[in-house]
């Protein structure tokens, strides 16, 4: 059968029918349903929601919907022994204590099982000592402290403001600096937008609001006790001392009311420059310790959280493909939340739910996609991307042979200004073409395309008339699919205006105030931005699953490879003496990129011309496209990060959320001037150039004519 016969409806009608079936009102209804109680990973409430979603996806018409469970390491506060931080006087008396919980939002005062703010996976401990303010606790902040200001954090408790980088990187940096505890806080400079009221009167963070979150440094490992393998019934588990990525010092988060009390007494060195000052009425002195009158007072942490192996549940739905059932397009997003999950994750889960409903409606009318679509509701994302990673570990052999694409579906909104897309270069043209066909929801762009409003509000820094599309980093469930398995991946959501809003993320992120009302009152009352995101995510899945030729353009990879090679060469050339001394050459990399560009161009020409009615040739060409992303995987992984195997992209070693290009070379060059053995360090740079050049050349050859 031809593809059109197999799928009953003509391709153009399919896509239109699918998109027309998506309704803002349904997304609103689903969001309300998913946010009335907390759905913390490992709890009964989240298990019940998994079963509800399973049941509803079956009703919507999927072929099968199964729960996939794993027993993974999670972390919870001790219910009878709360975590807090004190200021103690010279006699050891607690003269100030931080709050034990966030004041609940109106209407939620009687909700039980709201987990108090905590840093997941913090070890237990009661360290006491002098405080050092370390700004955002980024690599460069510790360089400034240790190298320029000669401030030693060893044996100190550090206080860092949230923002700029993943909190796990902050904790790692503090550990490496010798700190014995970490206090994380939300500064109004980063989490309070000027001119907006605090929740419940606006979308800003109140002084008692606190950001929860895990502080692991897993580097893609998944469950800390079973790296590389699923945490199933017969799993061999590491001892806690050998667990991957656990922090070694106590960590606790606080709000800015409590932070004010700690920071207002700080003495020692003045802040090095204005970039170290937040918006509190405190001096932002670095310390160590408190100023004159308070110099005998210390800070003490009281952390009693426990790590527990706990059962988690993914929901996996299948819509079997009519023509290529052994080719999988995956739409996945997490279900677990820190509290109500008004934005993270349920604004995404509600969109996935509506996408499933729309696909189900088409299926009930006799349609099937060309390829199989898998839908996933992941568990324990907030605890380190555990549900998605364990499932991918369990199914890795199938995924590496059959995985066409993964589309992520966490929070649909982090603002309401414009679209934000991060994806593999293979999907650039898909995203461009799709957004040209969708209507913009933005004020002032009535009757205009989404592409037009997006390009106007978020222009590409390199190509005029095109929108910005960013590199994939991590911090979400696409990680295992892209960084470990090399499956083409993408994500889309509505975002803020980064130029006018300098706060990090959205102010109420991971707080108790992330409610349904936050979204319905302040972010998207008409749910039009949610609908647009549903159309983008759903439209991408539809095209990936249904187009006869996969909608991947390998020429776009050639363009970015050149850009990344230019960038890393420029970084390296900042050390010209060493480049000359150690004969460091980028010739092999530039040559490989040139070859890739030429071969990709020829492949694209063949793609236009081949006989699409020949199913063998069609499958062959599609397989070359599908396996191109896979060709960038190095089976040995990156140095000290075996589960980050993509040679072109990896999460930054300094910020898990950010993507880095040619990460092997980048990390080898990073701070190379401080290395004790320059010959060895530059030898590693040369080795990484070799690995990158080989990988690009090998990937190019997968696009050559097969014989």
């Amino acid at each position: 059968k031809s593809s059109n016969e197999a799928t009953n409806i003509t391709p153009k009608h399919n896509m239109k029918a699918f998109l027309d079936e998506l309704k803002a009102e349904n997304i609103k209804k689903f969001l309300y349903n998913f946010t009335q109680i907390p759905h913390l990973a490992g709890t009964e409430q989240n298990f019940q929601l998994a079963k509800q979603i399973q049941s509803q996806w079956k009703e919507f018409g999927l072929d099968s919907v199964e729960l996939a469970h794993y027993d993974v390491l999670l972390s919870y506060p001790n219910k009878t022994h709360p975590n807090y931080i004190s200021i103690i006087n010279e006699d050891g008396n607690e003269i100030f204590n931080t709050s034990l919980f966030e004041p609940p939002p109106p209407g939620y005062e009687n909700v039980s099982d709201i987990v108090p703010p905590f840093s997941a996976f913090s070890p237990q401990g009661m360290p006491e000592g002098d405080l050092v303010y370390v700004n955002y606790a980024r690599t460069e902040d510790f360089f400034k402290l240790e190298r320029d200001m000669k401030i030693n954090c060893s044996g100190k408790i550090v206080i860092a403001r949230y923002g700029k980088v993943f909190r796990g990187n902050k904790v790692k940096n503090a550990q490496l600096a010798g700190a014995k505890g970490v206090i994380l806080y939300s500064d109004p400079a980063d989490y309070f937008a000027p001119g907006v009221k605090s929740y419940p009167d606006g979308w800003n963070l109140p002084g008692g609001g606190v950001q929860r979150g895990n502080i692991l440094n897993l580097n893609g490992a998944g469950d800390p006790l079973t790296p590389g393998y699923p945490a199933n019934e017969y799993a061999y588990r590491r001892g806690i001392a050998e667990a991957v990525g656990l922090p070694s010092i106590p960590v606790h988060p606080i709000g800015y009311y409590d932070a004010q009390k700690l920071l207002e007494k700080m003495g020692g060195s003045a802040p090095p420059d204005s970039s170290w000052r937040g918006s509190l009425k405190v001096p932002y002195n670095v310390g160590p310790g408190f100023t004159g009158n308070f110099s005998t007072q210390k800070v003490k942490m009281h952390i009693h959280s426990t790590n527990e192996v706990t059962r988690i549940y993914n929901v996996i739905g299948t819509l079997r493909g009519a023509v290529e059932p052994d080719r999988y397009v995956i739409l996945g997003g997490h279900r677990d939340s820190w509290v109500f999950g008004g934005i993270d994750p349920q604004s995404g889960a509600a969109v996935v739910h509506e996408i499933v409903r729309s696909f189900g409606t088409l299926k009930k009318e006799g349609w099937r996609p060309r390829r199989t679509i898998l839908f996933a509701s992941w568990d324990a994302e907030e605890f380190g991307l555990l549900g998605s990673t364990e499932w991918a570990e369990e199914n890795s052999r199938l995924l590496q042979e059959r995985g066409v694409a993964y589309i992520n579906a966490d929070s649909s909104i982090e603002g309401n200004y414009t679209l934000r897309v991060d994806c593999t270069p293979l999907m650039y043209s898909l995203v461009h073409n799709l957004t040209k066909e969708l209507k913009s929801p933005d004020e002032g762009f009535e009757g205009k395309s989404l592409y037009e409003s997006w390009t106007k509000k978020s222009p590409s820094p390199e190509f005029s008339g095109m929108p910005r599309i960013s590199k994939l980093g991590s911090g979400n469930d696409f990680e295992v699919f892209f960084q470990r398995l090399g499956i083409a991946s993408g994500r889309a959501r509505y975002t803020k205006n980064w130029e006018t809003n300098k706060f990090s993320g959205y102010p109420l992120y991971h707080s108790v105030y992330e409610t349904y009302e936050l979204v319905e009152k302040f972010y998207d009352p008409m749910f039009k931005y949610h609908l647009t995101v549903a159309q983008v995510r759903g439209g991408m899945v539809f095209e990936l699953a249904n187009s006869i030729v996969l909608p991947f353009d390998c020429r776009d990879y050639a363009v970015v490879l050149r850009k990344y090679a230019d960038k890393i060469y420029s970084i390296s050339m900042k050390h010209p003496q060493e480049m000359k001394t150690y004969s460091v050459s980028f010739d092999s990399l530039f040559s490989a990129v040139k070859n890739f560009t030429e071969i990709a161009s020829k492949f694209s020409e063949r793609l236009q011309d081949f006989d699409k009615s020949n199913p063998i040739v069609l499958r062959m060409m599609n397989d070359q496209l599908m396996f191109l992303e896979r060709a960038f995987i190095d089976p040995l992984g990156l140095p000290d990060r075996p589960f980050y195997r993509h040679v072109i992209y990896a999460p930054s070693s300094h910020n898990k959320y950010a993507g880095e290009s040619f990460p092997g070379i980048y990390d080898a060059l990073f701070d190379i001037e401080s290395k004790v053995d320059p010959s060895k360090a530059w030898g590693e740079v040369k080795r990484q150039i070799y690995v990158a050049a080989f990988t690009v050349q090998a990937a190019a050859e997968t696009l050559s004519e097969v014989a």
Partner: nanobody, 113 residues
Framework: EVQLVESGGGLVQPGGSLRLSCAAS????????MSWVRQAPGKGLEWVSS????????DYADSVKGRFTISRDNSKSTLYLQMNSLRAEDTAVYYC??????WGQGTLVTVSS
């Protein structure tokens, strides 16, 4: 064989301008990022600027930012460095660099009153 030949150096007064050129041959010029590196008398090598495959992607040392402009003409296989508001501390031999290992012979720029 890769060849890089710099020209355009000379003596110039402080505040003056010069334009350096680097004629490239023996390789596919447009496929490579290129750089300028300088060496002041009695000093080590100092990176000045790099350029990618087009004139959009450029990078400069802080010491020359806003005064120097790197550019390229792929059709002529030539790299340029436009140097404005020259200072005495810009006095150096300026080298054109291909991939880290292929260097020109250099051209001397002297800034003096």
């Amino acid at each position: 064989e890769v060849q890089l030949v710099e020209s355009g150096g000379g003596l110039v007064q402080p505040g003056g301008s010069l334009r350096l050129s680097c004629a490239a041959s023996g390789f596919s010029f447009s496929s490579y990022a290129m750089s300028w590196v300088r060496q002041a008398p009695g000093k080590g090598l100092e990176w000045v600027s790099s350029i990618g495959d087009n004139n959009n992607s450029t990078d400069y040392a802080d010491s020359v930012k806003g005064r120097f402009t790197i550019s390229r003409d792929n059709s002529k296989s030539t790299l340029y460095l436009q140097m404005n508001s020259l200072r005495a501390e810009d006095t150096a031999v300026y080298y054109c660099v291909k991939d880290g290992v292929h260097w020109g012979q250099g051209t001397l720029v002297t800034v003096s009153s």
